[in-house]
Amino acid sequence: ARNGDHCPLGPGRCCRLHTVRASLEDLGWADWVLSPREVQVTMCIGACPSQFRAANMHAQIKTSLHRLKPDTVPAPCCVPASYNPMVLIQKTDTGVSLQTYDDLLAKDCHCI
Amino acid sequence: ARNGDHCPLGPGRCCRLHTVRASLEDLGWADWVLSPREVQVTMCIGACPSQFRAANMHAQIKTSLHRLKPDTVPAPCCVPASYNPMVLIQKTDTGVSLQTYDDLLAKDCHCI
């Protein structure tokens, strides 16, 4: 169950999808990827206050225990709930191949 | 691909399964759960240094971009890779019911 979508910390501060532009060099891919030369990486960034976008029962438990034992139990974390596929043109021993990765770009986010 | 399982920060410091004992009161469940009275909550806690238990390509990207832009991109986060089911004996309007929850206890952990 995705719980609250209202961010008590203010607009844009809570767990949500962000886009970060990265070159092949930034990603450490320059030696094995030919294209794209730049990737618009979508990733999940932001705080996970109490019950905000709680992914499941485990996330709700984590929130409760973090409130009780903040030094022992971390707050839930903002991570991808699903992904968008992306194709990469890769160098191979003999030339190039096209490979689709299903777990590269975040599609939406939740707290867990 | 689960990458390295060697923790460079020292034994037990990296992302792994921990058990936290919690009462129904701790969890905020006292008003709707009868049993168990105490839960051994297994959860994922610990640091996610470079490529440690990287869940997928997205986690590897996150590691690279965190190294470049630590103020913008957070490090990967230690979260459940899978769950163990657990049964709760719940209060109902008419008595009790047994409900199995598939997403309550972490079974193993990875970084994402």
Partner: antibody
């Protein structure tokens, strides 16, 4: 495996609108980096790139034909469409669609022959 | 538009020979060049990407080289099934443009 197949009316009269369909399988236009191009081939002008459309609906056209071209897609039915308005005899050609991954056109359809005849 | 010139419209070769098909860009296109093979009655087939990278499944007797304005497709140990027309294409800038093609004839 990846396949593309073009379909069209075969023959039209001058000034009519040509509607072409590319039906494909083996890939999805929901995948970042994927696209479909249209290219035509005639004995007079050789291979001529017409347009392409990407997964994110980014569209590019050959400037020499831009005012007459419209490319669109139906992601759910794995189809890409090209419309060419006001056809004349210079548009007589074989029309191909090709899969694009970023800047690589790696698979082409078998082509559909089109003639403008009065 | 960037004009891609394949000066030789026809080339004649024998089975087992080595042949080089050339392509010249009117301006610098880096390595943003592809090569295609079109057999009689068929659609073009992609051979080379980024001037020198063979697509998977393309025999290693096909080799691409060059950068800037001068590009070459070399076929070593020519086979009878290589009878085809070969096209270069630049994708450095819009509109993408093709060379006029070089027909390879087998003696």
């Amino acid at each position: 495996q990846v396949t593309l197949k073009e379909s069209g009316p075969g023959i039209l009269q001058p000034s009519q609108t040509l509607s072409l369909t590319c039906s494909f399988s083996g890939f999805s236009l929901t995948t970042s980096g994927m696209g479909v191009d249209w290219i035509r081939q005639s004995s007079g002008k050789g291979l001529e790139w017409l347009a392409h459309i990407y997964w994110d609906d980014d569209k590019r056209y050959n400037p020499s034909l831009k005012s007459r071209l419209t490319i669109s897609k139906d992601t759910s039915s794995n189809q890409v469409f090209l419309k060419i308005t006001s056809v004349d005899t210079a548009d007589t050609a074989t029309y191909y669609c090709a899969r694009r991954a970023w800047d690589a056109m790696d698979y082409w359809g078998q082509g559909t022959s089109f003639t403008v005849s009065s | 538009d960037i004009v891609m010139t394949q000066a030789q419209k026809f080339m004649s070769t024998s089975v087992g020979d080595r042949v080089s098909v050339t392509c010249k860009a009117r301006q610098n296109v880096g390595t943003n060049v592809a090569w295609y093979q079109q057999k009689p009655g068929q659609s073009p087939k992609a051979l080379i990407y980024s001037a020198s990278y063979r697509y998977s499944g393309v025999p290693d007797r096909f080799t691409g080289s060059g950068s800037g304005t001068d590009f070459t497709l070399t076929i070593s140990n020519v086979q009878s099934e290589d009878l085809a027309e070969y096209f270069c294409q630049q994708y450095n800038s819009y509109p993408y443009t093709f060379g006029g093609g070089t027909k390879l004839e087998i003696k």
